[in-house]
């Protein structure tokens, strides 16, 4: 079921109700529960394009428009600093076996940019997103989501990875950041912390959310995944911070009560088909974009980052099954498996409505926003 | 259980036609690129031809070796995909994979048996 | 096209000893894909997109590598593993293979 909309001037305000998350493009690993330090990429430039390593009948679109509840910045907790142990690590680590570059996760050795030189890139995701500084551009138009609401069958695969929970989508999931800028949906996954942790990639002035869902998509423009890597524009991803609310998601639930059967790393289900769209927020209109990579080794960069300003609302044992029911490598459990932000190094974070207007709990004193630029291109 | 079953094999003499047909079963078999890859001792495994979805025209590639005398062709309503072999060459002998590649990633889940294709005089 | 070399070409190990095979690329791919060939059998998927392991592989098989190298492990080598082992790239077409490396057991 929906839940109300959010009020206007609210960046990344009350939550609706979403689909669940499976993982998505880039395979996430598992995340260490040892305290760890902020270890950003280097400045060097990202690797040409040739060195970096490797990561269908349209329904209507779907109307994205009720009022929705309001959450104000003001309301959210205080800034995590960098370092603070929530913070994982922009490692790689050594896998159980001695191997140095076969298994990486979050934390560890060997450093990500070993696995993959694109890894150190200047570009790389995930971001913090500051309202107040996102250049508020007319000309991204709401998103356009068509055939994501699929038949039970035929069924979906539903894998644990051992870095995270991945539904493969089928053909036909298009998705349209805006006029000539179309995709196709290959999967999604999700992004989490454990108790009392939360776990999203992206953050909100430091604000880390409970958990976060990726819908990876493929630019029209290449056949496969391996041919877009790299590629300006040729992956985009949707993404989404998932919070508490107080009832039950139930687009969420005919995933989330699958897990248990996949609790082992490896293990793999098969789920009936639902409504993808309903795993995301309603409001197709309100969200922040730019440029960014990968959040995983290959980390490759030119990907879209289209990030949610409406957040999903699942229920506290929802979020709870979600960060305590899988297991990753080496008998640990699937948790934390989110990288630290990473530094904008002068990228613009854009946003398709007003996000700096009235919305922060410092307006007292005027900022100076920053103009669109390239919006729509 | 995701199965491929190539049939259509056998001895044939240079210059002639053969047509290999593979059915699948265990799956959703119009979701799937499908693809022939065979394999001799001489060249070991080569990837030959793929066709696509529906959605995508039934659009088809083909290995520079092969263009112009091999067709793949599919039907989803019986779940089989075909490869006919015209004006056949010794050097396409080999055994004949039918495979499946989910769309959009770059590698093959899927092998059937194989069958043996003898061109020879 | 890109032509893939691997190395050895053949090989041999105790059981329970560490078996690293390599597969270098001319141009640089995204992915390395793996797999597995015993004799009389068909190929079956090892490793995709370079190091996650297939649906039933033990996870003492590992992919890694990056740009032009590529490389697969098998940490701790049993009876079972010996096969022939193949890498293919796909970035760009031609999909192409590697000539295989054979892993014999001693």
């Known amino acids: 079921q929906r839940l109300p909309r959010m009020q206007e001037d609210s960046p990344l305000g009350g939550g609706s109700s979403g689909e669940d998350d499976p993982l998505g493009e880039e395979d996430l690993p598992s995340e260490e529960d040892s305290p760890r330090e902020e270890d950003p990429p280097g400045e060097e430039d990202l690797p040409g394009e040739e060195d970096l390593p490797g990561e269908e009948d349209l329904p209507e679109v779907k109307p994205k428009s009720e009022e929705e509840g309001s959450l104000k910045l003001e309301d959210l907790p205080t800034v995590e600093a960098p370092g603070d142990p929530q913070e994982p690590q922009n490692n790689a680590h050594r896998d159980k076996e001695g191997d140095d570059q076969s298994h990486w996760r979050y934390g560890g050795d060997p450093p990500w940019p070993r696995v993959s030189p694109a890894c150190a890139g200047r570009f790389q995701s995930p971001v913090d997103i500051r309202p107040q500084l996102a250049a508020f551009c007319p000309a991204l138009r709401p998103l356009e989501l068509l055939g994501f609401q699929l038949p039970p069958l035929p069924e979906l695969r539903l894998r644990n990875n051992g870095h995270s929970v991945q539904l493969t989508l089928p053909p036909g999931l298009e998705m349209a950041l805006g006029p000539g800028r179309e995709y196709r949906a290959l999967q999604l996954h999700l992004h989490w912390g454990a108790a009392g942790r939360p776990g999203s990639e992206h953050t909100v002035e430091g604000h880390r959310f409970p958990a976060e869902i990726h819908v990876v998509h493929l630019s029209t423009a290449f056949a496969r995944v391996d041919e877009a890597l790299g590629r300006p524009g040729g992956l985009a991803v949707l993404a989404a911070f998932l919070e508490e609310g107080p009832e039950e998601n139930s687009a969420y639930e005919q995933l989330l009560s699958r897990l248990e059967e996949i609790a082992e790393e490896g293990s793999e289900t098969q789920v009936p088909g639902l409504d993808i769209s309903a795993l995301l927020p309603s409001d197709f209109s309100r969200y922040f974009q730019y440029e960014g990579s990968l959040t995983t080794p290959p980390c490759a960069q030119g990907v879209i980052w289209t990030v949610f300003n409406q957040t999903v609302m699942l229920s506290a044992k929802q979020l709870h099954t979600l960060s305590d029911t899988l297991w990753g490598p080496g008998d640990s459990r699937l948790q934390l498996n989110f990288r630290a932000t990473q530094p904008l190094n002068g990228r613009v974070i854009e946003a398709s409505f007003p996000a700096g207007v009235d919305s922060s709990p410092r307006a007292a004193e005027p900022v100076q926003l920053n103009s669109c630029l390239a919006a729509g291109d | 259980e995701v199965k491929l079953e190539e049939s259509g094999g056998g001895l044939v003499q240079p210059g002639r036609s053969m047509k290999l047909s593979c059915v699948a079963s265990?799956?959703?078999?119009?979701?799937?690129?499908m693809d022939w890859v065979r394999q001799s001792p001489e060249k070991g495994l080569e990837w030959v031809a793929e066709i696509r979805l529906k959605s995508d025209n039934y659009a088809t590639h083909y290995a520079e070796s092969v263009k112009g005398r091999f067709t793949i062709s599919r039907d989803d309503s019986k779940s089989s995909v075909y490869l006919q072999m015209n004006n056949l060459r010794a050097e396409d002998t080999g055994i004949y994979y039918c495979?499946?590649?989910?769309?959009?990633?770059?590698?093959?889940?899927?092998w059937g048996q194989g069958t043996t294709l003898t061109v020879s005089s | 096209q890109i032509v893939l070399t691997q190395s050895p070409a053949v090989m041999s190990a105790f059981p329970g000893e560490k078996v690293t095979m390599t597969c270098s690329a001319s141009?640089?791919?995204?992915?390395m894909h793996w797999y597995q060939q015993k004799a009389g059998s068909s190929p079956r998927l090892l490793i995709y997109?370079?190091?996650n392991l297939s649906s039933g592989v033990p996870a003492r098989c590992s992919g890694s590598g990056s740009g032009t190298s590529y490389s697969l492990t098998i940490s701790r080598m049993e009876a079972e593993d010996a096969a022939t082992y193949y890498c293919?790239?796909?970035?760009?077409?031609?999909?192409?293979f590697g000539g295989g490396t054979k892993l014999e057991i001693k």
């Open positions: 293919q790239q796909w970035r760009s077409y031609p999909p192409t």
């Open positions: 265990g799956f959703t078999f119009s979701y799937y690129w």
């Open positions: 141009s640089s791919v995204g992915y």
């Open positions: 495979t499946r590649a989910p769309h959009y990633y770059g590698y093959f889940d899927y």
């Open positions: 997109d370079t190091s």
